[in-house]
Amino acid sequence: EEELQVIQPEKSVSVAAGDSATLNCTVSSLIPVGPIQWFRGAGPGRELIYNLKEGHFPRVTAVSDPTKRNNMDFSIRISNITPADAGTYYCVKFRKGSPDVELKSGAGTELSVRAKPSAPVVSGPAVRATAEHTVSFTCESHGFSPRDITLKWFKNGNELSDVQTNVDPAGKSVSYSIRSTARVLLTRRDVHSQVICEVAHVTLQGDPLRGTANLSEAIRVPPFLEVTQQSMRADNQVNVTCQVTKFYPQRLQLTWLENGNVSRTEMASALPENKDGTYNWTSWLLVNVSAHRDDVKLTCQVEHDGQPAVNKSFSVKVSAHPKEQGSNTAAENTGTNERNIYGGSG
């Protein structure tokens, strides 16, 4: 009598997640009587996938009509495939008994699942950094298979090179994750800049997934300060202007000090945006010169985005004869920034 053969014609089958997988198996003979079972994996830890004899396997169906005894096709179809279904499947013939006796196994069919990566999520630094500093952005994508994947970083369309990328796990797995970190050098012009993490995978059919982050969330552009005096008015009042320019974000508090005493505090709000995304703000202070015997030291103090205050001071000279206007009153800019202000073009 011819020896029973269990034939699994495909060594491997690749299926997209969510689709159905057909695993083919035929036997050369129906003798002896006994069930066919499908297992994932081999050895004592193998997992029963389908038993034509009995059991409830909601995702698995026999491809051919199992009520036809002369049917030697024991192929199965597994629906709604997920990465967790990956593995090698064996079609095994048993002889009926107590227990059933394993007679012959097919060579096995390796099922690989093509699973799309999740949409890349890009996260930036927890705190803002100023121009000329380097910040790190992280991109993560999960759940893809097979392991081969390409990740690229772009800033305003230009590919970044200071990148470190890892795919986990290193060994075989049902699905994989990628994590990449890009280091980006900030400039004052980066308020409107964007970094893009682009992921390409076989499941995406040439249409990569992208995750983005705006550098506006990561950058702080400190303001330039300039204090100037307009000409003396007829009513002995001097108009002093504090110009705060090229800053980002908008969160800014300006305080006027007269001889060290707080005169007025203002908060920036609803400012128009410059083309480069930064903001400008001008504050005026009217100083009544006739109310002062001595020179007045005016200080424009700016606190930007929770950072230490920046001061710019200005002295208004008060003459012994205040009624004589014009040349008798001098203005002197004695202010200095108490921290470095980075220059840049707007």
Partner: antibody
Framework: EVQLVESGGGLVQPGGSLRLSCAAS????????MHWVRQAPGKGLEWVSA???????YYTGSVKGRFTISRENAKNSLYLQMNSLRAADTAVYYC????????????WGQGTMVTVSS | DIQMTQSPSSLSASVGDRVTITCRAS??????LAWFQQKPGKAPKSLIY???SLHSGVPSKFSGSGSGTDFTLTISSLQPEDFATYYC?????????FGQGTKLEIK
């Protein structure tokens, strides 16, 4: 429609012979293990004999050497040749199809009565 | 030979009742156990195979369970047409053997 129809039953004297037939329709009889089961009047069911798809045959102890199971593929029919009949063989004889993969009985004929009496 | 013992031999019940019939094998038969229903003057009807699988067309009020040596047939809500004799059968090895039957009668 899948169907089994038995014939050939009747009254026979002890020591006599009888040949039961089972005509199958709606399926290919040679693709299934086929069985004969009997039921004596007022008694329970008793498996008698089987023939496998490879032609292998099996019998219950009390009929071994007296009964012969066979089939004729061309006629899609199953037979039970009964010799040296005894009163204890009196029963309704059912032709039964063995089910898929494991030979569980799934289709029964309506039965044919065999009476062994002098 | 493997002996099959059914209990009880007879059982009286009312329409709507839930009844359980047990079958014990003299040795391990895996789950190669079938249940049949027979009405007077009729051929047996196959209900259950491999201990718990319902044959096509059999209503779900019939259920089977067990493995090894101890098995049960449960009818969840008796209807008039369910009053009959029920047989279990092992078919793990020849000679196939039946239980002696359980006659289910109307109370």
């Amino acid at each position: 429609e899948v169907q089994l129809v038995e014939s050939g039953g009747g009254l026979v004297q002890p020591g006599g012979s009888l040949r039961l037939s089972c005509a199958a329709s709606g399926f290919t009889l040679s693709s299934y293990d086929m069985h004969w089961v009997r039921q004596a009047p007022g008694k329970g069911l008793e498996w008698v004999s089987a023939i496998g798809t490879a032609g292998d045959t099996y019998y219950t102890g009390s009929v071994k050497g007296r009964f012969t199971i066979s089939r004729e593929n061309a006629k899609n029919s199953l037979y039970l040749q009964m010799n040296s009949l005894r009163a204890a063989d009196t029963a309704v004889y059912y032709c039964v199809r063995g089910g898929v993969w494991d030979d569980a009985f799934d289709i029964w004929g309506q039965g044919t009565m065999v009476t062994v009496s002098s | 030979d493997i002996q099959m013992t059914q209990s009880p031999s007879s059982l009286s019940a009312s329409v709507g009742d839930r009844v359980t019939i047990t079958c014990r094998a003299s040795q391990d038969i895996n789950n190669y156990l079938a249940w049949f229903q027979q009405k007077p003057g009729k051929a047996p009807k196959s209900l259950i195979y491999t201990a718990s699988s319902l044959h096509s067309g059999v209503p779900s009020k019939f259920s089977g369970s067990g493995s090894g040596t101890d098995f049960t047939l449960t009818i969840s809500s008796l209807q008039p047409e369910d009053f009959a004799t029920y047989y279990c059968q092992q078919y793990v090895s020849y000679p196939y053997t039946f239980g002696q039957g359980t006659k289910l009668e109307i109370k």
